[in-house]
Amino acid sequence: TQNKALPENVKYGIVLDAGSSHTSLYIYKWPAEKENDTGVVHQVEECRVKGPGISKFVQKVNEIGIYLTDCMERAREVIPRSQHQETPVYLGATAGMRLLRMESEELADRVLDVVERSLSNYPFDFQGARIITGQEEGAYGWITINYLLGKFSQKTRWFSIVPYETNNQETFGALDLGGASTQVTFVPQNQTIESPDNALQFRLYGKDYNVYTHSFLCYGKDQALWQKLAKDIQVASNEILRDPCFHPGYKKVVNVSDLYKTPCTKRFEMTLPFQQFEIQGIGNYQQCHQSILELFNTSYCPYSQCAFNGIFLPPLQGDFGAFSAFYFVMKFLNLTSEKVSQEKVTEMMKKFCAQPWEEIKTSYAGVKEKYLSEYCFSGTYILSLLLQGYHFTADSWEHIHFIGKIQGSDAGWTLGYMLNLTNMIPAEQPLSTPLSHSTYV
C-alpha cells in the first residue's frame, strides 16, 4: 500500500523591513519539530511594497494602510489560513526612521503608531513595530548570513552544500548597504575591540563569538549622495552643479529645500542665492571618487586604527558577504563575479561613468531612469567605502563575496531578527535526538 503524506507540521513567520527607500515583507517557513536546528528556516516569499519608505509618510499617515495592503494580502494568500493566528509578524524600521526620530520623536512615533494599527487589522499574531538600532541591524545581518551558510552547525562536512562554503567553521563578516546607513560586522582575529559601543558577545549553539559591529548613519547610498551634493553646492559659482558622478548629458533639477531636509546634510548647510540648482553630469569616475572621499574624515582617530570619522575598526579578518545595495548595485553593473579583481572593477566603473546619458538610456531601455541615473554614483561610492572607508585592498578584495541570496533566502537582517525573537538560536548546542516518528513515514 502506498504511504499517505502526513500533513506538514510547519510554522511561518513574517518580518517587514521598513527601510529608508522602501519596505519589503519576508515570509519564512520551518519544520515545527526542528526549531532549534541550524539552517532549517528558509524564505518562501519576498514582497516589495510599492512606494517609498515609511518615514516619507510623515505628512500623510492616513495612506500607510493602503501602502501595506498588497503585501499583507499576499501574506494572507501564501500562509495557510489555519496558520494565520499563530504566525508572528514583526516590523523593524531602520535608518530612515532613525533620521526621522532625530528630527522629531513625536512624528516618528506617530508613523509607527499608524503602522501598528494597520498591521493589527490582519489575522496574524502581530508582535510590534519598532526602530531597530544600527548595532542590531549589523548583528542580525551577521547572524543571517552565517546561519544560512551553516557556520553555526558543529557537523563538519566533506562536501560543500552551500555557495561560498570554505568547509570550516570560520564565520563570514557582513557588509550591509542601505539607503541611509551602512553596517560592517565581523569577528576580529585575537584583537581587543577598543570601543565598547562596537563590541558584541554572543553564545550561539555552544560557541562564544566576540563580534565587532558599527553602523554609519548617513552613509547609506542615498544619504551619501545628498551629503555629496550639499558639500559640492557650497563651492558652486552659480545654480549649475557640474557633477562627475552622473553621466555626461544627464540633467536633473534639485530643490535646495529637499537637499537640506535630511539631518545628514546639516553640516554642509548654508544660505544659497537660489532655491533650485541643476545637476549637469560630466561622467568622470576619478573626480567622483575624489569628491566622495571628502565625506570621510580620516584625519582624526583616537584608536589604534579607524574606519573614518573617528570610528574604531579592527584589522579586517576572513571572508565577507556584501549584501543589500552592495549586491543590487554591483549586480546591475555585472561586477559580482568572484573572478573580477578590484582593478578590473575600477576600470569598468571608469568606462561606465564616462558613457553618455543618451547612450545609457538606450542600452538599458527597460530600467526606470530614476534608478538608472544612480548607478555611476552608487558604484563609485561602493568602491570608495570599501577601499578607503573600510580599508579593503586589491588583495583582500577577493575576500568580498557579493551575495543576493543564500539557499533561496535573501541576505539581510530580517531572518536573524526573526530567529532571535522566536528564540530559534539556542545558546547551547541542542542534544542530538533520535529520529522522530515523522522521519520514518
Epitope: 522602501h22 510599492k50 516619507k56 501602502y67 530614476k370
Partner: nanobody
C-alpha cells in the same frame, strides 16, 4: 505629468446614490494606488477609499459597506460608487494618484484632481 479630472458630483437626497469618476490623462499604472479624499467645509481633507495597483481596497470606517472603489485600467479611470448617502457625506471629493518611489529617496510629488462637489440634502 499626469492630470486627474473628477466628475459625477451633484446634489442628491439622503439615502440616494452617486457615482464619481476620475479620469487620468496618462496611465494610472504610474501610481501605486489611487485614492478618493474628501474635504467638508472647515474640516481637514480625509481619505475615503483607495485601490492599489494590485486591486486591493481600503475604506474609511465611516463609509464601509456604503461606498465602493473600482478601477478600469483600460480607460485609465477610477470610480467611487456611493450609496446610502448621508448629509455628513457632503464635501468636495478629490481624486489622488499615490505615487511611486523617487530619485535617491526624494519626496514624491502628489497628484490631485481639482475636486467635485457632492451635496446630500433634502
Amino acid at each position: 505629468q499626469v492630470q486627474l479630472v473628477e466628475s459625477g458630483g451633484g446634489l442628491v437626497q439622503p439615502g440616494g446614490s452617486l457615482r464619481l469618476s476620475c479620469a487620468a490623462s496618462g496611465s494610472i499604472f504610474s501610481f501605486n494606488a489611487m485614492g478618493w479624499y474628501r474635504q467638508a467645509p472647515g474640516k481637514q481633507r480625509e481619505l475615503v477609499a483607495a485601490i492599489t495597483s494590485g486591486g486591493n481596497t481600503n475604506y474609511a470606517d465611516s463609509v464601509k459597506g456604503r461606498f465602493a472603489i473600482s478601477r478600469d485600467n483600460a480607460k485609465n479611470t477610477v470610480y467611487l460608487q456611493m450609496s446610502s448617502l448621508k448629509p455628513e457625506d457632503t464635501a468636495v471629493y478629490y481624486c489622488k494618484g499615490i505615487g511611486g518611489s523617487t530619485w535617491f529617496g526624494e519626496d514624491e510629488p502628489d497628484y490631485w484632481g481639482q475636486g467635485t462637489q457632492v451635496t446630500v440634502s433634502s
